[in-house]
């Protein structure tokens, strides 16, 4: 049985879309069950009903799981440090990046060290 679609068309009449980009299925309550998925194509948007199977949510937890390297050194210029993650496991329908970069602010201690190192270099 076809599920009802909530369509919001922003394109002109008869405008055709070659490729829709769909966001994740977001359950209406809790972390699984019936929800909605939003799609965009050019100026058009569409909202459709979808379902996140509860057993999948339990099995996978996060859509994309990464294995991370150690944090890099503190960048004194930006006050941040970086580490890279490589995809370890994805939920079957999750379109995960193969690698991701995560940044975070340096702790005051490492920031001070980075500044001191920079200062030494200028002497």
């Amino acid at each position: 049985v076809a599920k009802k679609k909530d369509k919001v068309k922003k394109g002109g009449p008869g405008s055709e879309c070659a490729e829709w980009a769909w966001g994740p299925c977001t359950p209406s309550s809790k972390d699984c069950g019936v929800g909605f998925r939003e799609g965009t194509c050019g100026a058009q948007t569409q909202r459709i009903r979808c379902r996140v199977p509860c057993n999948w949510k339990k099995e996978f937890g996060a859509d994309c799981k990464y294995k991370f390297e150690n944090w890099g050194a503190c960048d004194g210029g930006t006050g941040t440090k970086v580490r890279q993650g490589t995809l370890k496991k994805a939920r079957y329908n999750a379109q995960c990046q193969e690698t991701i970069r995560v940044t975070k602010p340096c702790t005051p201690k490492t920031k001070a060290k980075a500044k001191a190192k920079k200062g030494k270099g200028k002497d």
Epitope: R37, C50, R51, K88, A90
Partner: antibody, heavy 117, light 107 residues
Framework: QVQLVQSGAEVKKPGHSVKVSCKAS????????MNWVRQAPGQGLEWIGM????????ILNQKFKDKATLTVDISTSTAYMELSSPRSEDTAVYYC??????????WGQGTLVTVSS | EIVLTQSPATLSLSPGERANLSCRAS??????LHWYQQKPHQAPRLLIK???QSISGIPARFSGSGPGTDFNLTISSVEPEDFAVYYC?????????FGGGTKLEIK
């Protein structure tokens, strides 16, 4: 790019188990679901199950729960599918395919398993 | 289990014509529908994923539509190398299932 190379054709007598291998090269083998699909002569495609190499999580089609066993060997980037007590109706080409929702999939060339007395 | 019904079973066309292949799901599967092409003695080849997403290396004449229960694969202008069997597959729930296939043959 991922290349999947499967083991050669097998001829087995009914009841004698058979193990098909699927060796991956190229991109990371351990990050993607490995599907197993079969195709009987002149028929359509039938999904057997899948396994994730990172933790060996396996999801089997209930139809094959007592028939197929899926395993992986991370050290050699190889996936295996073992058919226990095969019968003549298990004669088919068996395919492995590595799935990523982001980039699509890559398939092995297929392994013909013939079960005949 | 989700049943996928493909139609027509056989489609006879001449090169240059437009092909419309249909796949209907027994319940809503969102956009979790993929299209494969298979030629004799070859493994299936993914043409379209998630109803309408294109695949690197696949000619632009192949396009897909959805989501919901009714899906279509369109070949805008059939080339001689497109004559093959086409399968749809759903990945919305276990077990993953395939449609019975549509054979595209030369008229």
């Amino acid at each position: 790019q991922v290349q999947l190379v499967q083991s050669g054709a097998e001829v087995k007598k009914p009841g004698h188990s058979v193990k098909v291998s699927c060796k991956a090269s190229g991109q990371s083998f351990s990050s993607y679901w490995m599907n197993w699909v079969r195709q009987a002569p002149g028929q359509g495609l039938e999904w057997i199950g899948m396994i994730h190499p990172s933790d060996s999580e396996t999801i089997l089609n209930q139809k094959f729960k007592d028939k197929a066993t899926l395993t992986v060997d991370i050290s050699t980037s190889t996936a295996y599918m073992e058919l226990s007590s095969p019968r003549s109706e298990d004669t088919a080409v068996y395919y492995c395919s590595s799935w990523s929702a982001k980039r699509g999939d890559f398939w092995g060339q297929g392994t013909l398993v013939t079960v005949s007395s | 289990e989700i049943v996928l019904t493909q139609s027509p079973a056989t489609l006879s066309l001449s090169p240059g014509e437009r092909a419309n292949l249909s796949c209907r799901a027994s319940e809503s599967i969102s956009n979790n529908l993929h299209w494969y092409q298979q030629k004799p003695h070859q493994a299936p080849r993914l043409l379209i994923k998630y109803a309408s997403q294109s695949i690197s290396g696949i000619p632009a004449r192949f396009s897909g539509s959805g989501p919901g229960t009714d899906f279509n694969l369109t070949i805008s202008s059939v080339e001689p190398e497109d004559f093959a069997v086409y399968y749809c597959q759903q990945s919305n729930s276990w077990p993953l299932t395939f449609g019975g296939g549509t054979k595209l043959e030369i008229k």
